[in-house]
């Protein structure tokens, strides 16, 4: 059974992931972002189901396309280079979902823009955090 310290650690990691995703969203989804229309042409694959930490596998698999989009953005929008930002997210995702269990991600038929994609994973983080508190 998860201890209170492991639950607290999970909560902190989720909060960190949430902040990173929100920072990316805020950095790109505003009219001052001159690359927004180009970023919206990139297609993202959404999870069919995202209710447990193991479903973060679906986010992990889309981190490469996410980095590609962020490479279009101007660096002033973020405090880190896209490669470093994605690397940080990847570390958190790996710790949260656990590397010992292999989970095959199932994707929904509908694809999404980067804005829809980020909003979906932000909602996921908020939902899991609410169950832990």
């Amino acid at each position: 059974a998860p201890t209170s310290s492991s639950t607290k650690k999970t909560q902190l990691q989720l909060e960190h992931l949430l902040l990173d995703l929100q920072m990316i969203l805020n950095g790109i989804n505003n009219y001052k972002n001159p690359k927004l229309t180009r970023m919206l042409t990139f297609k993202f694959y959404m999870p069919k189901k995202a209710t447990e930490l193991k479903h973060l596998q679906c986010l992990e698999e889309e981190l490469k396309p996410l980095e590609e989009v962020l490479n279009l953005a101007q660096s002033k929008n973020f405090h880190l280079r896209p490669r470093d930002l994605i690397s940080n997210i990847n570390v958190i995702v790996l710790e949260l979902k656990g590397s010992e269990t292999t989970f095959m991600c199932e994707y929904a038929d509908e694809t999404a823009t980067i804005v829809e994609f980020l909003n979906r994973w932000i909602t996921f983080c908020q939902s899991i955090i609410s169950t832990l508190t």
Partner: antibody, heavy 119, light 108 residues
Framework: EVQLVESGGGLVQPGRSLRLSCAAS????????MHWVRQAPGKGLEWVAD????????YYADSVKGRFTISRDNSKTTLYLQMNSLRPEDTAVYYC????????????WGQGTLVTVSS | SYELTQPPSVSVSPGQTARITCSGD??????AYWYQQKAGQAPVLVIY???KRPSGIPETLSGSSSGTTATLTISGAQEEDEADYYC???????????FGGGTKLTVL
């Protein structure tokens, strides 16, 4: 109501220059990227160039790179296309167009201005 | 340079379904957009982000995408659907926009 009105087209000799304008109204011009698209007589659409909302990013089709320059004046809500070293194959109707809201599709188009390059 | 490939023409009987395809290597990772252009008029956006319809576009026009092919479907085609249809997307870098060669839809 969104309106895009192109002007500046006409007959020009090969090697000469021409500047097209696109006057925009009915939306917050400085929020949106703008595109130029052309269509040669009886042919398909060809993307020419686009410019970001603040003018900091410009992209060009290979066919016009180094000869055409896209620019904008947000205070005048006007888009420009400076065309130098014109060739007969640049003969086309030139449209300005813009994505609107949160999509990258070109929602609004002008009616176009005809550029004829001939001696 | 990146290319999007469309059939030059598609013919359909009134009331039937027409499908216009658009092929491009980047389409698994990039959205497709579709424009309708009637003779002497400016193009009109009819589908964006593979399958979304702008307001005012009838439900008879729909879009889909699978792998390297995007498809525009015109259900119950009528004479007023006769037009040139163009797909539009970006290359792998997301830097350059490209139109397909266009497809002339004829409703016989």
């Amino acid at each position: 109501e969104v309106q895009l009105v192109e002007s500046g087209g006409g007959l020009v000799q090969p090697g000469r220059s021409l500047r097209l304008s696109c006057a925009a109204s009915g939306f917050t011009f400085s929020y949106y990227g703008m595109h130029w698209v052309r269509q040669a007589p009886g042919k398909g659409l060809e993307w020419v160039a686009d410019i970001s909302n603040d003018g900091s990013n410009k992209y060009y089709a290979d066919s016009v790179k180094g000869r055409f320059t896209i620019s904008r004046d947000n205070s005048k809500t006007t888009l420009y296309l400076q065309m130098n070293s014109l060739r007969p194959e640049d003969t086309a109707v030139y449209y300005c167009a813009t994505p609107y809201y949160d999509s990258s599709g070109l929602d609004y188009w002008g009616q176009g201005t005809l550029v004829t390059v001939s001696s | 340079s990146y290319e999007l490939t469309q059939p030059p023409s598609v013919s359909v009987s009134p009331g039937q379904t027409a499908r216009i395809t658009c092929s491009g290597d980047a389409l698994p990772k990039r959205f497709a957009y579709w424009y309708q252009q009637k003779a002497g008029q400016a193009p009109v956006l009819v589908i964006y982000e593979d399958n979304k319809r702008p307001s005012g576009i009838p439900e008879t026009l729909s879009g889909s995408s699978s792998g390297t092919t995007a498809t525009l479907t015109i259900s119950g085609a009528q004479e007023e659907d006769e037009a040139d249809y163009y797909c539009y997307s970006t290359d792998n870098t997301g830097g350059l926009w490209v139109f397909g060669g266009g497809t002339k839809l004829t409703v016989l």
